[in-house]
């Protein structure tokens, strides 16, 4: 097999084994098999024999030409038909890759999730490159001018313990692969300005059948940050549009937020917070569902009113790990 090839010749690609997607490429195969003047040379792509665009260059060499090659990866090998051999003889094999140079990384963002002990930096990498692309994150202290570099394939977590050069830094990202290199703009950060409070979580909901039914949402966070601003958004599950309520919050106790909602409708709630006045928000919390109860027809009977409206009857929902929001990454 081709797992560990002992080549009886040579296979090479022009312009290179990694090339820009959509290029015309040539694959050359040169046989060097003892006691064999090849009758024919064959090329295979992903195990399939190629039948067209093959040119015999001389007694031992052939060329396979591809126009507008669009496959991200292919495994190529070539064989020879030797006069005294029943089977084709393997010459050599090579994996080829096509893709794109990286785009300029943009939207570089660095945040510190409270209690994580890390600064997490992310960026928009741009279009898919299809080939192995590495990123170098540069972190330069504005106080000491010391620069640290971190190699990664996607985002990076940098321990806050390693950020010894004060509070102010420049961060930028270089992207590189076999086809090119690009560099982002520099982002200036202050460590105190990029902290995102510990996640806010909705724990339960209840609807109280008072004179006007009222839904109370209970929610909390383990944050130690004193000044926190939060948003709660909610909508009927059948609706597209969210309603948003804003809160200035002190998390020394569980928060209770009141909503007057339509009866007999399933609602979904989410919450997110930020340190007041700072730039970055938490991602929206997991989706929390609560169905409001049906209203009881209002009648004049006092007894009936007493039995229903004033009974303190509640309908409750409790959080048990709901579906994740499609907006988890929304921290801008």
């Amino acid at each position: 097999g081709i797992t560990n090839i002992n080549c009886s010749g040579h296979i090479w690609v022009e312009p290179a084994t990694i090339f820009k997607m959509g290029m015309n490429i040539s694959i050359y195969c040169q046989a060097a098999i003892k006691n064999c003047q090849p009758r024919k040379l064959h090329f295979y792509k992903n195990g399939i024999k190629e039948r067209f665009q093959i040119t015999r260059i001389n007694k031992t060499t052939a060329r396979l030409w591809y126009k507008n090659f669009l496959e991200p990866h292919a495994s190529m090998y070539c064989t020879a038909e030797c006069p005294k051999h029943f089977q084709e003889t393997l010459i050599c094999g090579k994996d080829i890759s096509s893709g794109y140079p990286p785009d300029i990384p943009d939207e570089v963002t660095c945040v510190i999730y409270e209690y994580s002990g890390n600064m997490t930096c992310t960026w928009n990498a741009g279009k898919l490159t299809y080939i192995d692309t590495k990123y170098v994150v540069h972190v330069k202290s504005l106080e000491t001018e010391e620069e640290q570099q971190y190699l990664t394939s996607s985002y990076i977590n940098i321990s806050t313990d390693s950020l010894q050069g004060g509070k102010k830094y420049l961060v930028w990202v270089q992207a590189a692969n076999a086809l090119g290199m690009e560099e982002s703009k520099q982002l200036q950060i202050h460590l105190d300005d990029i902290v995102i409070p510990s996640a806010a979580v909705i724990s339960r909901a209840e609807t109280i059948n008072a004179t006007v039914p009222k839904t109370i949402i209970y929610w909390d966070s383990q944050t130690t940050i004193e000044k926190v601003s939060c948003e709660m958004r909610y909508k009927a599950t059948t609706n597209q549009t969210w309603n948003v309520k804003e809160f200035d919050t002190n998390f020394t106790y569980v928060q209770q937020s009141e909503f007057y909602l339509e009866p007999n409708i399933k609602y979904v709630f989410q919450v997110r917070c930020q340190e007041t006045g700072k730039r970055y928000w938490q991602p929206w919390s997991s989706l929390f569902f609560h169905k409001t109860p049906e209203t009881v027809p209002q009648v004049t009977s006092k007894a009936f009113q007493h039995d229903t409206w004033n009974s303190g009857l509640t309908v409750a929902s409790i959080s048990t790990g709901h579906l994740t929001s499609d907006n988890r990454g929304d921290i801008g």
Epitope: G1, Y44, G47, I48, K49, E50, Q87, E88, L90
Partner: nanobody
Framework: EVQLVESGGGLVQPGGSLTLSCVAS????????MGWFRQAPGKEREFVAA????????VYAASVKGRFTISRDNAKNTVYLGMKSLKPEDTAVYVC????????????WGQGTQVTVSS
């Protein structure tokens, strides 16, 4: 027509092993080669390995060489993909394919079997 049905996928820990099977039925004599491809979420379908009826019997993608082994039982019309030293990046839907030199490609595809490598 050739029908292909895969089995053997599942959840495995990094470093673990798994063997996938693909049973072919129908006009199996019309296939020169049977192969495996894989597709991870958000990525292109990627060639993994192929086994030819005759001539050079096997070929592997660089990313799996030395870890995966493709074999074929002609009596059972089955092709196998033995996978060892599995890595999280091997997580994908693995799809069996049958092809012919006459058409210059893979003409028949199975539905796929999910392989998840995670601790």
């Amino acid at each position: 027509e050739v029908q292909l049905v895969e089995s053997g996928g599942g959840l495995v820990q990094p470093g673990g092993s798994l063997t996938l099977s693909c049973v072919a039925s129908g006009r199996t004599f019309s296939t020169d080669v049977m192969g495996w491809f894989r597709q991870a979420p958000g990525k292109e379908r990627e060639f993994v390995a192929a086994h030819r009826r005759n001539g050079i019997s096997t070929v592997y993608a660089a990313s799996v060489k030395g870890r995966f082994t493709i074999s074929r039982d002609n009596a059972k019309n089955t092709v196998y993909l033995g996978m060892k030293s599995l890595k999280p990046e091997d997580t994908a839907v693995y799809v069996c394919a049958a092809g012919s030199d006459a058409s210059g490609g893979y003409d028949y595809w199975g539905q796929g079997t999910q392989v998840t490598v995670s601790s």
